[in-house]
Interface confidence: medium
């Protein structure tokens, strides 16, 4: 570490005095101090001499000696006071610029340490400091305003009490700059706009920032609009607003509008699309198939997307039959708005009952007229099966009726023994009926089919089973011939209650 002679931390001299500061180190050394007149510098290898024959108040300051080759970067310092009775302050800078919340050092150095007790910081023309100004003083460095605020951007003077009167320094201008976190915040309202030709429209572009230095403009299809801005300041932010008013829109007003704001941190932009239409419109659509099939007992949500301008004047869900005159409960219908011109309407149908199959229509109305979208809802049922013994054209015949939706397929099984259901080990014979006769097939109803199995003689220790299946499930009926006549037996598991 270099050594300074005289080896005192502070040196007090009078104006006009000769001052010699010598610094010695292991290698070459360098002086650093406030820019001031009359110093001469003499270097001799490992020592350096700073001297003046005529010290003035402007030589007041801290002089630091460093050894550039020292890896530890050691230094030594001495503070020189040039005690001028007419000049209590040496001001090193007349403008100080800091960012908000930084400490601001106002570099007015006291030329006489004895005056320290009577120093104060004031604003120019003797005005007091603003409330909540937190500051401290160091005779070596000056006044520090801690965590400076934008509002403290003022002109300051350092004051010292000399012989009972206050002596001021020249003024120091403090500029506290806002910390600009990024480009201005932007809003463009509305996010989307539709108007009929001839209607009025308004688009508002606004930008705000903590700092007043920013630009904002509105452009239409990349062409800047010359709309003047309205400026405001609230919530500690500067706001600039551009309002585009169009009394009677035409097709040339349509297109992309961008709100663009920029400052030193960069640029932000946001866009919206303005559509001009010839007349009112109302479009209904669904992402779902309009023909729906759901298993009985399950639930279904029917969804309709509506695109409309102007807004809807009315809408409702209607059940068009064929089973009953019930109407969907309003509580099961709800609407959600995606944006100004697009809405989704949902009808919830929980735990569907047989009487709820049929047509559901969504109707909507706006000045463009009425539109409707109709869903057809068919319920799926597992097959129900029954078997009877009868004679057809003199032949003994087992007649199996199966009803369900979709249309059931029919399989006959003959198996040994009396059983509720033939299992593989007992099966003697299997017949598939690829084309059972369709007895009834009305829209939204179950399909009933009939399959005939001609049996010349019924084997009494055997079971004849009719099995029907579709995509929902299967059903069966076991027919057991007994000597007293035929005995039919539906299996327990098919006592179906919807």
């Amino acid at each position: 570490i270099p050594v300074i002679e005289p080896s005192v931390p502070e040196l007090v001299v009078k104006p006009g005095a000769t001052v010699t500061l010598r610094c010695v180190g292991n290698g070459s050394v360098e002086w650093d101090g406030p820019p001031s007149p009359h110093w001469t510098l003499y270097s001799d290898g490992s020592s350096s001499i700073l001297s003046t024959n005529n010290a003035t108040f402007q030589n007041t300051g801290t002089y630091r000696c460093t050894e550039p080759g020292d890896p530890l970067g050691g230094s030594a310092a001495i503070h020189l006071y040039v005690k001028d009775p007419a000049r209590p302050w040496n001001v090193l800078a007349q403008e100080v610029v800091v960012f908000e919340d930084q400490d601001a050092l106002l570099p007015c150095l006291l030329t006489d340490p004895v005056l320290e007790a009577g120093v104060s910081l004031v604003r120019v023309r003797g005005r007091p400091l603003m409330r909540h100004t937190n500051y401290s003083f160091s005779p070596w460095h000056g006044f520090t305003i801690h965590r400076a605020k934008f509002i403290q951007s003022q002109d300051y003077q350092c004051s010292a009490l000399m012989g009972g009167r206050k002596v001021m320094s020249i003024s120091i201008r403090l500029k506290v700059q806002k910390v600009i976190p990024g480009p201005p915040a932007l809003t463009l309202v509305p996010a989307e706009l539709v108007r009929i030709r001839g209607e009025a429209a308004q688009i508002v572009c606004s930008a705000s920032s903590v700092d007043v230095n920013f630009d904002v403009f509105l452009q239409h299809n990349n062409t800047k609009l010359a709309i003047p801005q309205q400026s405001d300041f609230h919530n500690n932010r500067y706001q600039k607003v551009l309002t585009l008013n169009l009394d009677q829109v035409d097709f040339q007003h349509a297109g992309n509008y961008s709100c663009v704001a920029s400052n030193v941190q960069g640029k932000h932009s946001t866009s919206m699309f303005f559509r001009v239409v010839e007349s009112a419109y109302l479009n209904l659509s669904s992402e779902q198939n309009l023909i729906q099939e759901v298993t009985v007992g399950e639930g279904l949500n029917l969804k309709v997307m509506v695109e409309a301008y102007p807004g809807l004047q009315g809408f409702n869900w209607t059940y068009l039959g064929p089973f009953s005159d019930h109407q969907p409960e309003p509580k099961l219908a709800n609407a959600t708005t995606k944006d100004t011109y697009r809405h989704t309407f949902t009808l919830s149908l929980p735990r569907l009952k047989p009487s709820e199959a049929g047509r559901y229509s969504f109707l909507a109305r706006n000045p463009g007229g009425w539109r409707a979208l109709t869903f057809e809802l068919t319920l799926r049922y597992p097959p129900e099966v029954s078997v009877i013994w009868t004679f057809i054209n003199g032949s003994g015949t087992l007649l199996c009726a199966a009803s369900g939706y979709p249309q059931p397929n029919v399989t006959w099984l003959q198996c040994s023994g009396h059983t509720d259901r033939c299992d593989e080990a007992q099966v003697l014979q299997v017949w598939d009926d690829p084309y059972p006769e369709v007895l009834s097939q009305e829209p939204f109803h179950k399909v009933t089919v009939q399959s005939l199995l001609t049996v010349e003689t019924l084997e009494h220790n055997q079971t004849y089973e009719c099995r029907a299946h579709n995509s929902v499930g299967s059903g069966s009926w076991a027919f057991i011939p007994i000597s007293a006549g035929a005995h039919t037996h539906p299996p327990d598991e098919f006592l179906f209650t919807p």
């Epitope: 239409h220 062409t223 800047k224 010359a226 709309i227 003047p228 585009l244 008013n245």
Partner: antibody
């Protein structure tokens, strides 16, 4: 379609105050920004300033601050006052509208002569 | 303020000629410039907006180009009704300023 019509005296004496009014039809005065432009005989065009329905104004700083703009939304009119006129203020005064760019609609202009 | 300097200040040409008028801005104004035509006793009429877009209803012989500080108005195949005074106007920043005008006369 917005239409503009200037009205006011054709002749004003030096040192007097000039008052011009522009009447707006075919559109709402609350929608746009309303400007005045002047053109001395045989010379170029000079923008004077604009006023918004809210009363906000913006003047051309190159011109002396003798101009005052005002607006009366109930009458769909806006006005210009120029105090202490001199011969240098002799010009055709146009009112114009800034809708999306300057100047979408113009009045036909009114000649004001300053002479004793 | 942004100064707009137009050249030439006057120009003589014949019907059928192609003429070019230049406007220079004292600082960059992107493409925030319009061209106007003015006939004696009439209000100015916009020909070109945003430096190069043709105003609706204006004949296609008029065209504009440029951005930043240098702009031109070109009239292809001059017609008798084109003899008038032409002004450029900047609206990049307030105050709005006009060029001093170019008077186009019949040779």
């Amino acid at each position: 379609q917005v239409q503009l019509q200037e009205s006011g005296p054709g002749l004003v004496k030096p040192s007097e105050t000039l008052s011009l009014t522009c009447t707006v039809s075919g559109g709402s005065i609350s929608s746009y920004y309303w400007s005045w432009i002047r053109q001395p005989p045989g010379k170029g065009l000079e923008w004077i300033g604009y006023i918004y329905y809210s009363g906000n104004t913006n003047y051309n700083p190159s011109l002396k601050s003798r101009f005052t703009l005002s607006i009366d939304t109930s009458k769909n009119q806006f006005s210009l006052r120029l105090s202490s006129v001199t011969a240098a203020d002799t010009a055709v005064y146009y009112c114009a509208c800034i809708a999306t760019r300057p100047f979408d609609y113009w009045g036909q202009g009114t000649l004001v002569t300053v002479s004793s | 303020d942004i100064q707009m300097t137009q050249s030439p200040s006057s120009l003589s040409a014949s019907v059928g000629d192609r003429v070019t008028i230049t406007c220079r801005a004292s600082q960059g104004i992107r493409n925030d410039l319009d061209w106007y035509q003015q006939k004696p006793g009439k209000a100015p009429k916009r020909l070109i907006y945003a430096a190069s877009s043709l105003q609706s209803g204006v004949p296609s012989r008029f065209s504009g180009s440029g951005s930043g500080t240098e702009f031109t108005l070109t009239i292809n195949s001059l017609q008798p009704e084109d003899f008038a005074t032409y002004y450029c106007l900047q609206y990049n920043s307030y105050p709005i300023t006009f060029g001093q005008g170019t008077r186009l006369e019949i040779k």
